[in-house]
């Protein structure tokens, strides 16, 4: 029977800069029941606080709700593992909420075949930013990526859309059914999951000629 091994805070994520969650990996348990607690202080403070919510994020997690989240303050946190034989601490982790955003997928993905008389036909793709993201403040810049493929194909074709919320694709195989998805990320945060796929049938008379 031994003291617990060193835990590690391995991931922190925020959907929108207003709440965030961190997860840790337990070290070895030393063969004894082990209790874990996450403590933190904010920059400029010496007062230590305990995790406000161990439930919402699932096992080995700490969730910081709106009233505990500030995008202006650095959080300095560590996990303490304790059993009857002793304690061990994770390394301190410095978290700036602005850097750990992983948004929800974009919404309202709409796909349409456009066939103007005087120009090449194209696939028109449009979407909306995730609900929780407030782009009006200027604190957020969301970047978007689109992927599409014929239904039976193995390989996705990927297009980077930058900050725009609509995109045109010209080169498509006539008569094929395509799957289309979109995802987003803040400037230096994490990519969201892909949105649910939208299917579009490309007409057989869709021409790629000039």
């Amino acid at each position: 029977q031994l003291p617990p091994g060193k835990p590690e805070i391995f991931k922190c994520r925020s959907p929108n800069k207003e709440t965030f969650t961190c997860w840790w990996r337990p070290g070895t348990d030393g063969g004894l029941p082990t209790n874990y607690s996450l403590t933190y202080h904010r920059e400029g403070e010496t007062l230590m606080h305990e995790c406000p919510d161990y439930i919402t994020g699932g096992p080995n997690s700490c969730h910081f709700g709106k009233q505990y989240t500030s995008m202006w303050r650095t959080y300095i946190m560590m996990v303490n593992a304790t059993n009857q034989m002793g304690s061990s601490f994770s390394d301190e982790l410095y978290v700036d909420v602005t850097y750990i955003v992983q948004p929800d997928p974009p919404l309202e993905l709409a796909v349409e075949v456009k066939q103007p008389e005087d120009r090449k036909p194209y696939l028109w793709i449009k979407w909306s930013p995730p609900t929780l993201i407030d782009l009006k403040t200027g604190w957020f810049t969301l970047l978007y990526e689109i992927r599409l493929k014929p239904e039976k194909a193995a390989e996705w074709e990927i297009h980077f859309a930058g900050q725009q919320t609509e995109f045109k694709i010209l080169s498509l195989h006539p008569g094929q059914k395509y799957l289309v998805q979109v995802r987003c990320k803040p400037d230096h945060g994490y990519w969201s999951a892909w949105s649910p796929a939208t299917f579009i049938q490309i007409p057989s008379d869709f021409t790629m000629n000039d």
């Epitope: 991931k11 920059e43 410095y94 200027g138 604190w139 230096h188 945060g189 990519w191």
Partner: antibody, heavy 120, light 112 residues
Framework: QVQLKESGPGLVAPSQSLSITCTVS????????VNWFRQPPGRGLEWLGM???????DYNSALKSRLSISKDNSKSQVFLKMNSLQTDDTARYYC??????????????WGQGTLVTVSA | DVLMTQTPLSLPVSLGDQASISCRSS???????????LEWYLQKPGQSPKLLIY???SRFSGVPDRFSGSGSGTDFTLKISRVEAEDLGVYYC?????????FGGGTKLEIK
């Protein structure tokens, strides 16, 4: 504990390219950005560029055309490549880990640096 | 690029004195996320730089409380309340808000 160690060629001929490896331990490169700096003998520090946890990069605009930063997360190594070296590229080159999880600044942990001399 | 100007270039002090180093940026260094990533580093002879202060005024772990940072916008100051022998070296301010990140030219703190 967190450690970074640079390894470089020491001497590089003018117009040749430079490759330096920064080998890290005590943290994962997927969670923390690594920056590169240099310091000519007796002079101040210059930021060269960085690679973020997600693999994206930022560069010093003055050096962007001849600089490349990459990494191998599984080997815990970050690479700096610089082309067309001249004598004024002689400096001690440092790698440093950011303070913030997934962040881009505040360099809490530094390697000891590797001295690169550009000379024929 | 943001130019960081440090004064003085050299600062002779007696042990126990207060020291003050100024750093001015050529433009605002408030990041688009609202934070100001202004940092101070100390480099002792033959060593790598060490982080003292981040985000203008926050002391890094293990940094003695005789070091304090202040300022906003474009004007920033590092103060050492009672200089000790181990504080001697070159101090650099640094902005990490706008790429390319830039250092000040350095201030050498030395014994009078």
């Amino acid at each position: 504990q967190v450690q970074l160690k640079e390894s470089g060629p020491g001497l590089v001929a003018p117009s040749q390219s430079l490759s330096i490896t920064c080998t890290v331990s005590g943290f994962s490169l997927t969670g923390f950005g690594v920056n590169w700096f240099r310091q000519p003998p007796g002079r101040g520090l210059e930021w060269l560029g960085m690679i973020w946890g997600d693999g994206s990069t930022d560069y010093n605009s003055a050096l962007k055309s001849r600089l490349s930063i990459s990494k191998d997360n599984s080997k815990s190594q970050v690479f700096l490549k610089m082309n067309s070296l001249q004598t004024d590229d002689t400096a001690r080159y440092y790698c440093a880990r950011v303070l913030y999880y997934y962040g881009g600044n505040s360099f809490a942990y530094w390697g000891q640096g590797t001295l690169v001399t550009v000379s024929a | 690029d943001v130019l960081m100007t440090q004064t003085p270039l050299s600062l002779p002090v007696s042990l126990g004195d207060q020291a003050s180093i100024s750093c001015r940026s050529s433009q605002s260094i408030v990041h688009s996320n609202g934070n100001t990533y202004l940092e101070w580093y100390l480099q002792k002879p033959g060593q790598s730089p060490k982080l003292l202060i981040y985000k203008v005024s926050s002391r890094f772990s293990g940094v003695p409380d005789r070091f304090s940072g202040s300022g906003s916008g474009t004007d920033f100051t590092l103060k050492i309340s009672r200089v000790e022998a181990e504080d001697l070296g070159v101090y650099y301010c640094f902005q990490g808000s706008h790429v390319p990140y830039t250092f000040g030219g350095g201030t050498k703190l030395e014994i009078k």
